[in-house]
């Protein structure tokens, strides 16, 4: 059985205020069973950016259909970027557990920074 890898290809992503940013994340295995969540930052202070299972994340859309059984692309788009959105974003795989899911593996992170201002 292939060991799961979390691939975030961009180390740095330059974004423009007011525009949409695409954060890429793919996995190399469907196992273990469990959701992929997005966070900004690490440790206890990290900010939840997207959870497919619960919550309402109006500025976030997924690139692929996460409901498809064999989906391995967990990339997201964040619309209407502001300066407060800068930081390093991580896609994180959780292993299904009871009563709570357990963090299994994190991607290496993509740093989002502000690039050129809109003209």
């Amino acid at each position: 059985e292939e060991e799961l890898q979390m691939i975030q290809p961009e180390k740095l992503l330059l974004v423009t205020v007011g525009k949409t940013a695409t954060l890429h994340c793919t996995v190399t295995s469907l196992l273990p069973v469990g959701p992929v969540l997005w966070f900004r930052g690490v440790g206890p202070g990290r900010e939840l950016i997207y959870n497919q299972k619960e919550g309402h994340f109006p500025r976030v859309t997924t690139v692929s259909d996460l409901t498809k059984r064999n989906n391995m692309d967990f990339s997201i788009r964040i619309s209407s970027i502001t300066p407060a959105d800068v930081g390093t974003y991580y896609c994180v795989k959780f292993r299904k557990g009871s009563p709570e899911n357990v963090e299994f593996k994190s991607g290496p992170g993509t740093e989002m920074a502000l690039g050129a201002k809109p003209s």
């Epitope: 440790g43 900010e47 919550g55 994340f57 209407s80 959105d85």
Partner: antibody, heavy 119, light 108 residues
Framework: DVQLVESGGGVVRPGESLRLSCAAS????????MNWVRQAPGEGLEWVSR????????DYAESVKGRFTISRDNSENTLYLQMNSLRAEDTAVYYC????????????WGLGALVTVSS | ETVLTQSPATLSVSPGERATLSCRAS??????LAWHQQKPGQAPRLLIY???NRATGIPDRFSGSGSGTDFTLTISSLQTEDSAVYYC??????????FGGGTKVEIK
């Protein structure tokens, strides 16, 4: 329906402590950042503190830094504000407010809890 | 820190008339501006977010416009129940979250 209900307000003397609670229902509490906002009698709104969805990230207004502590219990859907070393200028109605997303406005407000600091 | 200045401080308008409230930011906040309504003795209520979007359940007589530093809340045909204080809030730069000083709308 989203509901936020504050409790724990009252009359205290300068230097004393008080803990406010905010019971949340009608939404996935653990997915959202939460805030405390206060309003002194006859005055405008003043943001006090913010806590991220997981509870490990906090921010405070300069006026309360070092005296107030925000926390949350996601298993109980409850937000807290521990207020120490209270001053007369802390007299206000304290509102808990839900944040629309991790970097957003306040989309739901509680009814408020009155805190009076007087000798 | 971004400062929000609301004007006028008080606005007296007859029922059925248009009310225009202004909120000016000391630096750009893009479209990241919300308007909240607070009636006497009540908690604030979200009216408008992202400068122009009406919140759920808000009547269409309320509209928001503007971007950058200058924003307007318009009540197209004032009703008696619109008597309240209106606050703008920016969420482009934070912390801290900032509110304007408020505009009190009175019924003539």
């Amino acid at each position: 329906d989203v509901q936020l209900v504050e409790s724990g307000g009252g009359v205290v003397r300068p230097g004393e402590s008080l803990r406010l609670s905010c019971a949340a229902s009608g939404f996935s509490f653990s997915s959202y950042a939460m805030n405390w906002v206060r309003q002194a009698p006859g005055e405008g709104l003043e943001w006090v503190s913010r806590i991220n969805s997981g509870g490990g990230g906090t921010d405070y207004a300069e006026s309360v830094k070092g005296r107030f502590t925000i926390s949350r219990d996601n298993s109980e859907n409850t937000l807290y504000l521990q207020m120490n070393s209270l001053r007369a200028e802390d007299t206000a109605v304290y509102y808990c407010a839900k944040q629309y997303d991790w970097n957003g406005f306040f989309d739901y407000w509680g009814l408020g809890a009155l805190v009076t600091v007087s000798s | 820190e971004t400062v929000l200045t609301q004007s006028p401080a008080t606005l007296s308008v007859s029922p059925g008339e248009r009310a225009t409230l202004s909120c000016r930011a000391s630096q750009t906040v893009g479209s990241k501006l919300a308007w909240h309504q607070q009636k006497p003795g009540q908690a604030p209520r979200l009216l408008i977010y992202d400068a122009t979007n009406r919140a759920t359940g808000i009547p269409d007589r309320f509209s928001g416009s503007g971007s950058g530093t200058d924003f307007t809340l318009t009540i197209s045909s004032l009703q008696t129940e619109d008597s309240a204080v209106y606050y703008c809030q920016q969420y482009y730069y934070w912390p801290p979250y900032r509110f304007g000083g408020g505009t009190k709308v009175e019924i003539k």
